[in-house]
């Protein structure tokens, strides 16, 4: 008799999930000498242990603590780039500006980037059919809790000037419900962080408008100021030129704001 399986609203675990995590771990530790000591099999075991045999709507941050411990990593706290709804450009930027780091440039972020996973209560099986959707099913699902945990830790580690890349093509440039708005903003440490500098990325279309005056940016400024952190904002009017100028800062066309 086939066992009844909970049908969730979200996509199932990414195919070849265990192999992908293990392969990514090996690759990361080879590229980053400071993480060479990491035992990738132990990392996978800790990752698996966080969600296997557990109800995928009852996952807690504590479930991920063994993985967090194994993935402990020191990044320069004054070189952190947060992002919201504009992951690709943020990653392109840190690929060029090698001394800056997004969460996905750390081991744990790199392992889980773009992956989905969940298990089932009381069975050691991984659910490849469906996983809980944050909105339609539950927020305490394995993927959401993972990102909440690593995002909180990443924000807590930040110091001096923290940068955040925001998508100017969205109706809410700053969204209180995003991971940045709901987790990272509230976990920046005022005793360590002097300034949050927002980079508002304009869409492909040419525009002269100052999106730093957007009401949602004013809302972000208010939240940050109340936490005794200074706030500044810059428009990135031409993202393509911005990246080009990061690559070639000596270029004569790179003197004006982009």
């Amino acid at each position: 008799v086939p066992r009844w399986r909970q049908q969730w609203s979200g996509p199932g675990t990414t195919k070849r999930f265990p192999e992908t995590v293990l392969a990514r771990c090996v690759k990361y530790t080879e590229i980053h000498p400071e993480m060479r000591h990491v035992d990738c099999q132990s990392v996978w075991d800790a990752f698996k242990g966080a969600f296997i045999s557990k109800h995928p709507c009852n996952i807690t941050e504590e479930d991920y603590q063994p993985l967090m411990k194994l993935g402990t990593q020191t990044v320069p706290c004054n070189k952190i780039l947060l992002w919201s709804r504009i992951k690709d450009l943020a990653h392109q930027f840190t690929q060029v500006q090698r001394d800056m780091f997004t969460l996905e440039d750390t081991l744990l972020g790199y392992l889980a980037d773009d992956l989905t996973w969940c298990g089932e209560f009381n069975t050691s099986k991984i659910n490849y059919q469906s996983c809980p959707d944050w909105r339609k099913d539950c927020s305490n699902n394995p993927v959401s809790v993972f990102w909440k945990t690593v995002s909180r830790r990443f924000a807590e580690a930040a110091c001096d000037v923290v940068h955040v890349m925001l998508n100017g093509s969205r109706s809410k440039i700053f969204d209180k419900n995003s991971t940045f708005g709901s987790v990272e903003v509230h976990n920046l440490q005022p005793e360590k962080v002097q300034t949050l500098e927002a980079w508002v990325i304009h869409g492909g279309r040419e525009d002269s408008r100052d999106l730093c005056q957007d009401p949602t940016i004013k809302e972000l400024e208010s939240i940050i100021s109340k936490r005794n952190i200074q706030f500044s904002c810059k428009n990135i009017y031409r993202p393509d030129k911005f990246l080009q100028c990061v690559k070639n800062p000596e270029d004569s066309s790179c003197t004006s704001e982009i």
Epitope: S171, E206, S208, Q213, S256, E257
Partner: antibody, heavy 119, light 112 residues
Amino acid sequence: QVQLQQSVSELRSPGSSVKLSCKDFDSEVFPTSYMSWVRQKPGHGFEWIGDILPNIGRIFYGEKFEDKAKLDADTVSNTAYLELTSLSSEDSAIYYCAREAYGSILGYWGQGTLVAVSA
Amino acid sequence: DIVMTQTPLSLPVGLGDQASISCRSSQSLLHSNGNTYLHWYLQKPGQSPKLLIYKVSNRFSGVPDRFSGSGSGTDFTLKISRVEAEDLGVYFCSQSSHLPWTFGGGTKLEIK
């Protein structure tokens, strides 16, 4: 060819409201182009009221018009709207909608709607 | 707000003559993205404005090459090399470098 078709003239009494419409016949471009509203008063030249980006509903207002005007857009009918409240004789003018041709450049203008406010 | 000042108020010209209209802004229109958002429009009696020149010197589609624009910073000029009867009307400059967009008071081009 007509690209922006505005509603007909309106006569209103002081204190009332009026809602003007501007239909864009280029349905491809309408959602992702800012639509501005500009008014022209005799002897006062042109005044920019504000603009809206229909697909995401982003709105900018001229400071002078923040409490006077309300912009709106419907991407199904490709129509932009300007609502003017608490009308006074000072609001008597021709109101134009104008869609940007390139970023931040008003390239295409409607024929204008005359609003007359009189007791 | 940026104030746009046009001179002259009225410009009588003969057909075939050259006409020159000046526009001055109260602050630089060079935007931090490298563009200068200064534009010229023509409004004929009973009609809505038509875009002639955008970003200082670019002719909008369908605009004859007798119209040209120049300038930088705060000083700009529209030139019509050989005035034709259809060019008569009121010319406006406008800036969209800084919100709110603002307009010049207009220059009326009329036949001498």
